[in-house]
């Protein structure tokens, strides 16, 4: 029987800069029941605090609700593991909420095949930002990425959409059923999970164009840019 091994705080994430959760990995248990506690203080403060909520984030976690979350302060935290034989402490982790944001996936992904009479057909998609993110405050700039593939294909084709919530793609295989997904990330932070897949059947008479792909501006009614395959690689994030 031994004191517990050193725990490690391995991840902290915030969905929206208003709340955040941190998770730790226990060290070895020393063969005895072990209690874990997370303590922290904020930059410029010597008063120590304890995790306010060990439940919401699941096992080995600490959740900081709105009244415990500040964008403007660095948190300095550590986890203490204690059993009957002694204690051990994790290394201190410095957490700035601004840099740990991982949003929920975008919502309401809609995909349609558009076949205008005077132009080539294209795949048009639009989506909404995740509900927890308030873009009106200016605290957030969300960037989007789309991926799609024929249903039976192994490889995804990925497109960077910038801040747009609408996107057009030419160059699809006629007669194929495609899966389309979208994800987002804040300017500082982590990519969300991919949204649930939306399926779209490409008509057999869809005109294939391998040379060009069409990406819309934010307003589809506005000017549109033709981007060559070569230029498009600058927009790819695989």
């Amino acid at each position: 029987q031994l004191p517990p091994g050193k725990p490690e705080i391995f991840k902290c994430r915030s969905p929206n800069k208003e709340t955040f959760t941190c998770w730790w990995r226990p060290g070895t248990d020393g063969g005895l029941p072990t209690n874990y506690s997370l303590t922290y203080h904020r930059e410029g403060e010597t008063l120590m605090h304890e995790c306010p909520d060990y439940i919401t984030g699941g096992p080995n976690s600490c959740h900081f609700g709105k009244q415990y979350t500040s964008m403007w302060r660095t948190y300095v935290m550590m986890v203490n593991a204690t059993n009957q034989m002694g204690s051990s402490f994790s290394d201190e982790l410095y957490v700035d909420v601004t840099y740990i944001v991982q949003p929920d996936p975008p919502l309401e992904l809609t995909v349609e095949v558009k076949q205008p009479e005077d132009r080539k057909p294209y795949l048009w998609m639009k989506w909404s930002p995740p509900t927890l993110i308030d873009l009106k405050t200016g605290w957030f700039t969300l960037l989007y990425e789309i991926r799609l593939k024929p249903e039976k294909a192994a490889e995804w084709e990925t497109h960077f959409a910038g801040q747009q919530t609408e996107f057009k793609i030419l160059s699809l295989h006629p007669g194929q059923k495609y899966l389309v997904q979208v994800r987002c990330k804040p300017d500082h932070g982590y990519w969300s999970a991919w949204s649930p897949a939306t399926f779209i059947q490409i008509p057999s008479d869809f005109i294939m164009n391998d040379e060009q792909k069409l990406i819309s501006e934010e307003d589809l009614g506005g000017e549109q840019k033709l981007i060559s395959e070569e230029d498009l690689h600058h927009h790819h994030h695989h």
Partner: antibody, heavy 118, light 107 residues
Framework: EVHLVESGGGLVQPGGSLRLSCAAS????????MNWVRQTPGKGLEWISH????????YYADSVKGRFTISRDNAKNSLFLQMNSLRAEDTAVYFC???????????WGQGTLVTVSS | EIVLTQSPATLSLSPGERATLSCRAS??????FAWYQQKPGQAPRLLIY???SRATGIPTRFSGSGSGTDFTLTISSLEPEDFAVYYC?????????FGQGTRLEIK
Amino acid sequence: EVHLVESGGGLVQPGGSLRLSCAASGFTFSSYEMNWVRQTPGKGLEWISHISSRSVIIYYADSVKGRFTISRDNAKNSLFLQMNSLRAEDTAVYFCAGITIFGIPEYWGQGTLVTVSS
Amino acid sequence: EIVLTQSPATLSLSPGERATLSCRASQSVSSYFAWYQQKPGQAPRLLIYDASSRATGIPTRFSGSGSGTDFTLTISSLEPEDFAVYYCQQRSSWPITFGQGTRLEIK
């Protein structure tokens, strides 16, 4: 609606003991850092003890260290202050207060009077 | 411990006037600083936290400023219910300490 209700105050002789209780309702007691604050006409407001959500972190003011013990029972939404070796200068209104790190929302009871006199 | 000194001890003003209350800390408390209002027979009520953020339900006429060692509470236009005792408080380090109070009274 939030309520913090202190009880256990009263008249006690110097050297005696009292146990103050604070019953909490209407908020997530187990998430809050809880505190005892006292107010005397002479010294004004004095923050005397602090206990973290699961009692891992406890602070005492030097004036009560070694004599007072703070504790909590999250299952019963209750905060306690065991006061031993009481002195005349401990005479005060004792408030319990629930705070977060920013103090919002911040909840206070209405206080219980402790009088130490022979 | 960090000592907080409030000035003035008493401030006599009329409703509608502007009140400026000051508090100086014996060492830097960053912005971990609060202001309270207390009326007779009541518990203190949090007005301002983190030096300049208004607590829930506090009217906009109350504002806080400052960082480090010098802090100010301003009441832009006094209402009759604002006459009370005001305390400053630091939450940077233990022991948490209060100032001795400023009594705001009707002139």
